[in-house]
């Protein structure tokens, strides 16, 4: 069945019914969203120009797809199954009038029942079900989802989650600040730097004295101990997580169905057995994969790996010798790991500016 | 990998009939909307018909309604168009294409097979 | 009904150009419009969804702009392999086409 694979999704109400104040339709979009939000782990954001997962609009007749309204009455809207483009997207008939009362068709209801099918439901044969397929009123002051929506809706996307336990923050302990630590691989994650060791990870908010630490599997079960390379494209809250020959795709923190796929699907030759450490580098919109001596430039618009590499990391990154832990991107500088120290690099004047011990970020 | 092959094609008189089958792999055919579009030879191109993942629903181009008959079979991947009473101006390659999955039909071609030739002609 | 009106029906560019195409409905069609790329003998390819979304594996050069009634496509810098036919399109209406040739 279709589902969106993201938790946090968009919505832009492209358009107003002149039926209704605009504040009053915000209003009730804001809370037929908050019905489904509710009961899952779904959040959603108002956009207020440039095109959202989930597209409203209000239409007559013919409106850029093969489903034409039939004016008042009828069809009084509707809405395709999630995915990119026009899926996802909810259109109501501007034939109907539409209110927040009794009167007319109520658009509270309507649109409860359109975003169902926008996050996926099919209609129910349940006359008590919202995505009972025949409009009745009922008052939205008091409106409830029945057990059967709360149902179908939690098979796609599960209950409400609460934030991953983690465990309390602390600042680190003394001893962490005397061992020789090396890291597994190192990458932002919206805020937040993640750095990984073995079966876990620590967490920390750069500036903040607070280090947290969590179980990779606790977090991500379908997601292996061991993780050897991470990078994130943050504009996509994308986080891509690579052991061996396959890579896993983390999207808004929820791990994307049909990973893990193999390197090679990114144009690595079959001489590569692991990356040792990756980063993305927003300005470039490039992957930088450092495999032993060399490294791979990936490019992530074109999705295809540049052509004319490998390249030595040695001549192409002055001062930074083989062989690379981790990197980490953060305020222009790539962070490169190696052992108990990492390297303070400068990509627009291609060199080292400070070299620091690793734990340097927990404050040691 | 997601393929379709349409066959079927061939030269046919004015008022004969031919079915047109396309042949779909690499995705959940039952769950997509399919569609047939056509293009004349050195023509633009021109949507013929298309049909709801169940196939209890079906959408005809007004040039072929009353001629056409859109259908599919799930259990076998695959999409058909039978065309009764052929006419000179059906001259086209005609392509099988994918579109989107659900109960509306978006018309959003994101895969299209290579096409078979259907000439009208005496 | 919906009408779909493409301009112009063909043009001569030159490797490296910056080419727009532009495409105009009599009506709002909202963000619901897409274009397609033909090459001579082959399937037409979807390059934009949704006015402006670039389908996967398509090249950044392509780029896709518009809402309401008049939309653009446009190509940065002309690459040997982007001479070709493109089709704007929305639900069962297509466009006239428009043939870009070398200059």
């Known amino acids: 069945r279709s589902r969106w694979m993201k938790r946090y999704l968009t919505y832009r109400i492209y358009n107003y019914t002149p039926d209704m104040k605009r504040e009053d339709v915000d209003y009730i979009f804001q809370k037929a969203f908050q019905v489904w939000s509710d009961v899952t782990p779904l959040r959603f954001r108002k956009l207020h120009k440039d095109e959202a997962d989930i597209m409203i609009l209000f239409a007559f007749g013919a409106h850029g797809d093969f489903n034409y309204f039939d004016g008042k009455g009828g069809t009084l809207a509707h809405a395709f199954y999630p995915g990119p483009g026009i899926q996802g997207d909810a259109h109501f008939d501007e034939a109907e009038t539409w209110t927040k009362s009794f009167q007319g068709t109520n658009l509270f209801l309507v649109a409860v029942h359109e975003l169902g099918h926008s996050l996926g439901l099919q209609h129910s044969n349940n006359p008590k079900s919202i995505m009972y397929p025949t409009y009745r009123y009922l008052n939205p002051s008091t409106f409830r989802l029945s057990a059967d929506d709360i149902r179908n809706i939690q098979s796609l996307y599960g209950a409400p989650v609460k934030p991953p336990s983690l465990t309390k923050p602390s600042s680190p302990p003394s001893t962490f600040c005397h061992q020789s630590l090396s890291f597994d691989a190192v990458t932002t994650v919206g805020e937040k730097i993640f750095f990984f060791k073995d079966w876990f990870f620590w967490w920390k908010l750069p500036g903040s004295p607070a280090t947290n630490i969590t179980s990779i599997s606790s977090i991500w079960p379908s997601i292996p101990s061991g993780i050897q390379a991470a990078y994130e494209i943050e504009s996509r809250n994308q986080l891509f997580l690579f052991k061996d020959e396959k890579y896993w795709l983390i999207n808004n923190l929820v791990p994307e169905p049909h990973y893990p796929r193999s390197i090679y699907s990114l144009g690595f030759s079959a001489s590569v057995k692991k990356v040792d450490a990756a980063v993305f580098d927003p300005l470039r919109q490039k992957v930088y994969f450092f495999v032993d001596k060399h490294y791979w430039r990936y490019d992530v618009r074109q999705e295809l790996m540049d052509p004319a590499y490998p390249k030595l990391i040695s001549t192409h990154f002055p001062g930074i010798k083989p062989k690379i832990d981790a990197v980490l991107y953060f305020k222009r500088h790539y962070y490169i790991f190696q052992g108990a120290y990492q390297l303070e690099y400068d990509p627009l004047f291609r060199r080292v500016t400070k070299t620091l011990k690793s734990t340097s970020w927990f404050g040691c | 990998e997601v393929q379709l092959l349409e066959s079927g094609g061939g030269l046919v008189q004015p008022g004969g009939s031919l079915r047109l089958s396309c042949a779909a792999s690499?995705?959940?055919?039952?769950?997509?909307?399919m569609h047939w579009v056509r293009q004349a030879p050195g023509k633009g191109l021109e949507w013929v018909s298309g049909?709801?993942?169940?196939?209890?629903?079906?959408m005809y181009a007004d040039s072929v309604k009353g001629r056409f008959t859109i259908s599919r079979d799930n259990s076998k991947n695959t999409l058909y168009l039978q065309m009764n009473s052929l006419r000179a101006e059906d001259t086209a390659v005609y392509y099988c294409?994918?579109?989107?999955?659900?109960?509306?039909?978006?018309?959003?071609?994101?895969?299209w097979g290579r096409g078979t030739l259907v000439t009208v002609s005496s | 009904d919906i009408q779909m009106t493409q301009s112009p029906s063909s043009l001569s560019a030159s490797v490296g150009d910056r080419v727009t195409i532009t495409c105009r409905a009599n009506?709002?069609?909202?963000?619901?419009l897409n274009w397609y790329q033909q090459k001579p003998g082959k399937a037409p390819e979807l390059l934009i969804y949704?006015?402006?979304s670039l389908q996967s594996g398509v090249p950044s050069r392509f780029s896709g702009s518009g809402s309401g009634t008049d939309f653009t496509l446009t190509i940065s810098s002309l690459q040997p392999e982007d001479f070709a036919t493109y089709y704007c399109?929305?639900?069962?209406?297509f466009g006239q086409g428009t043939k870009l040739e070398i200059k």
């Open positions: 294409a994918r579109d989107i999955v659900g109960p509306y039909s978006a018309g959003l071609f994101d895969y």
């Open positions: 399109q929305q639900a069962g209406i």
């Open positions: 690499g995705f959940t055919f039952s769950w997509y909307w």
């Open positions: 949704a006015a402006s």
């Open positions: 009506q709002s069609i909202y963000t619901y």
């Open positions: 049909i709801s993942p169940s196939g209890g629903m079906t």
